[in-house]
């Protein structure tokens, strides 16, 4: 932004500048250019020997200016365009200034003036241009400063040129008031802080309903000597409930919200929320719908799932495989997990209790993501009831639970308890036992064994007794051994797999249990 202190051309000849010597040299004249009257100060004493003609402006109040810019528009005639070349003719003039705290009026003293520069034209007006009224206008700009007094004068010294001053414009520069990144920067006088620091740092203030982001830098701009803003640092963001519209922050419309200070616009209230009011920072959930603590406010409100579908319990001796399908209503969420609980009842007494401690699950029964699980180590002649509950991220916000149950009766034998009776370098003697009450139901026992690490082959031995010797084994080798009762109903519960090791040929191996 340029703040003009003096504009000769704009004054339409009404500025009465002082000429020295009076009545000679510089002269105010009017001309017609582009069908418009223009005024100029002109001098053309090119054949009268040495010249020293001065033209002084009126006193100019400095205002806030520290450095002023002087823009001159002028024309200079070619000395060769005059007959005989006009031997005393010059093609330059001198620019001066003087500072003062008061207007000296018509009291003009050359010694008070300091030379700014010799002003020379880039283009001179040759005869053909003059004749054709082609004004070869030159534009020169000079900077003066720092100024310290209340005002100043400019003066133009003619030393024998044929020159016309068409425009004298004096101005200083300001960086204009500006809105940038939602920050308002005040109008700032363009000054160099120092030669090494040609930029003035200016702090901005956030516009209404805008804030400096948390942990961010406040808005700063740099005002150059040329009155231009440079290098913005930091920014302001529209606060929660407001969005950026051009250079302002506007409240979110009803039905929209914004939860934090950011560059993003207001978002439409998501599904299953109540319509928000103007300037909302969030949208409340409809009744029966919830938000998990980790859910973003932009996410739809959700509800707990319905119970799992089609729960089935398939008994396999002392094991049960539970299978189910996902709930029909997921509540609008993907984070569904399942938990399985177990209850056992004694048929004789009808007494029931939890059985988590006595059964084994194929994977932890809480926070299951798959839709099946195998439960083993079930006791025979026992009734089991399994409950599968579906949960999601908002289930914890309600007291009701969504589960389905399935019951199964176990007629299976208890798994045999196996131990190593004896061993040699090539044999293992294994014994086992089962409760007396179940022995009458066992038809035979099946012993399965294989070398540890060899998954491709195994051996099976059947016996009616409670022991077996496994021969033809390799020395110093670990074998995996399992015993399973065979009943009329099929396979009974299998023992756990035991690791037993034959003796080494040196006979120095330990017995493994």
């Amino acid at each position: 932004k340029e703040v003009v202190l003096l504009d000769f051309a704009a004054m339409k000849g009404e500025l009465g500048w002082l000429t020295h010597p009076y009545g000679k040299g510089w002269d105010l004249m009017q001309n017609i250019m582009d069908d418009m009257p223009i005024y100029m100060y002109s001098v053309c004493n090119v054949v009268s020997g040495d010249q020293d003609n001065w033209l002084r402006t009126n006193w100019v109040y400095r205002e806030e200016a520290e450095r002023i810019f002087i823009e001159l528009k002028f024309t200079v005639r070619d000395c060769n365009s005059f007959p005989g070349g006009a031997s005393s003719c010059k093609e330059t003039f001198n620019l001066y200034y003087a500072e003062s705290d008061v207007d000296y009026g018509t009291n003009f003293q050359k010694r008070q003036f300091t030379k700014i520069d010799t002003i020379a034209p880039d283009e001179i007006t040759v005869s053909s241009d003059f004749e054709a009224r082609n004004v070869k206008l030159n534009v020169e700009e000079r900077m003066v400063g720092p100024l310290t007094r209340k005002g100043f004068y400019l003066a133009f010294q003619d030393i024998g040129a044929c020159v016309a001053l068409l425009s004298v414009r004096v101005y200083y520069k300001k960086c204009p008031e500006m809105l940038q990144s939602l920050a308002r920067f005040p109008e700032t006088i363009a000054v160099a802080v120092s030669d090494t620091q040609p930029l003035a740092t200016v702090a901005g203030t956030c516009v209404d309903h805008a804030v400096v982001p948390y942990g961010g830098e406040g808005p700063l701009m740099h005002c150059t000597v040329d009155g231009e803003w440079l290098v913005p640092i930091g920014q302001c963001l529209c606060q929660e409930g407001y969005e950026k519209v051009e250079d302002a922050c506007r409240a979110c419309s009803p039905g929209f919200f914004k939860s934090e200070a950011s560059e993003s616009p207001c978002l439409e209230c998501p599904e299953h929320t109540l319509p928000s009011t103007e300037g909302a920072t969030s949208c409340q959930c409809e009744e029966g719908y919830f938000r998990a603590p980790e859910d973003p406010l932009s996410m739809s409100c959700t509800r707990p799932p319905s119970a799992p579908n089609y729960l089935t319990a398939i008994g396999m001796g002392a094991k049960v495989e539970l299978r189910w399908t996902a709930p029909k209503d997921t509540g609008g969420r993907q984070d569904i997990v399942y938990s399985v609980t177990c209850e056992q009842c004694w048929p004789e007494s009808g007494e029931c209790g939890p059985c988590e401690a006595s059964v084994r699950y194929s994977e932890p029964p809480h926070a299951l993501t798959r839709t099946s699980v195998t439960v083993s180590d079930l006791e025979p002649h026992m009734n089991y009831t399994f409950a599968v509950e579906a949960r999601n991220g908002v289930s914890g916000l309600v007291t009701s639970r969504s589960f389905r149950t399935a019951s199964v009766s176990i007629n299976q034998t208890e798994p045999p308890k196996v131990r190593l009776e004896d061993r040699s370098t090539t044999s293992l003697s294994v014994t086992w036992s089962i409760p007396v009450s179940q022995q009458s139901r066992v038809w035979k026992y099946e012993v399965t064994y294989r070398k540890k690490g060899d998954a491709n082959s195994y051996n099976v031995r059947r016996t009616e007794g409670f022991s077996v010797t496994l021969d033809d084994l390799a020395p110093d080798t670990t074998y995996l051994v399992q015993v399973q009762a065979l009943t009329q109903e099929g396979q009974g519960a299998g023992s756990k797999v035991h690791e037993f090791q034959t003796l080494s040929t040196e006979g120095s191996a330990n017995m493994a249990v």
Epitope: D27, M29, Q30, N31, I32, P37, M40, S42, V43, C44, N45, V46, V47, T75, V76, R77, S81, F82, P83, S127, S128, F130, E131, A132, R133, V135, C162, V163, A164
Partner: antibody, heavy 128, light 107 residues
């Protein structure tokens, strides 16, 4: 020394035509703006027409516009005025005049010109 | 067109007198004014241009002044060779108009 010598004047009937010439010498003719100025018997001066140094632009007084044509031949150092549809009020002494910007000691040329050099004139009489 | 009015139309003066002729323009012409001298049967001669600039070879007893609409030609110390008719001419517009003339006669 600058010399301008008009010729071609004489008696002509109303509606008739005449061509005036102005022979120039003693200066660089192609640098000068040239003009015709007339003076009716016992009256003041009246500007008629002008032509630029290289043949343009041309200007005419309203009283002669459309009837008179100014031209020049720089190779012959001669200025012309072709006068058609002559009227009785065109009776006057016709002067050829010149202006050289080199003798105009001003920084910016005036909107038009004045006349630094004049010929002795030639009389044109329009009468039946 | 710009009208130029001279006054007086004629005047009688003696050798050595100071004579002033005025010229008024119907609208402002800045300083775009010339003065000419014409003797009977002769062509006009340029005296002054741009209101106050003396043409080459013109005696310094002739001077011009004024701007806008009011102009004057002054002969300080009239000489026998100065008895003639004087015309002003504006060249602020392309219609370069002359005043009607002022005749300076011997008293």
């Amino acid at each position: 020394e600058v010399q301008l010598l008009e010729s071609g004047g004489g008696l002509v009937q109303p509606g008739g035509s005449l061509r005036l010439s102005c022979a120039a010498s003693g200066f660089t003719f192609s640098h000068y703006m040239m003009a015709w100025v007339r003076q009716a018997p016992g009256k003041g001066l009246e500007w008629v027409s002008r032509i630029g140094p290289s043949g343009g632009p041309t200007h005419y007084a309203d009283s002669v516009k459309g009837r008179f044509t100014i031209s020049r031949d720089n190779s012959k150092n001669t200025l012309y005025l072709q006068m058609n549809s002559l009227r009785a009020e065109d009776t006057a002494v016709y002067y050829c005049a010149g202006y050289d910007s080199g003798y105009d000691y001003v920084a910016v040329a005036g909107p038009a010109e004045y006349f630094q050099h004049w010929g002795q004139g030639t009389l044109v009489t329009v009468s039946s | 067109d710009i009208q130029m009015t001279q006054s007086p139309s004629s005047l009688s003066a003696s050798v050595g007198d100071r004579v002033t002729i005025t010229c008024r323009a119907s609208q402002s012409i800045s300083t775009w004014l010339a003065w000419y001298q014409q003797k009977p049967g002769k062509a006009p001669k340029l005296l002054i241009y741009k209101a106050s600039n003396l043409h080459t070879g013109v005696p310094s007893r002739f001077s011009g002044s004024g701007s806008g609409t009011e102009f004057s030609l002054t002969i300080s110390g009239l000489q026998p060779d100065d008895f003639a008719t004087y015309y002003c001419q504006q060249y602020n517009s392309y219609s370069r108009t002359f005043g009607q003339g002022t005749k300076v006669e011997i008293k």
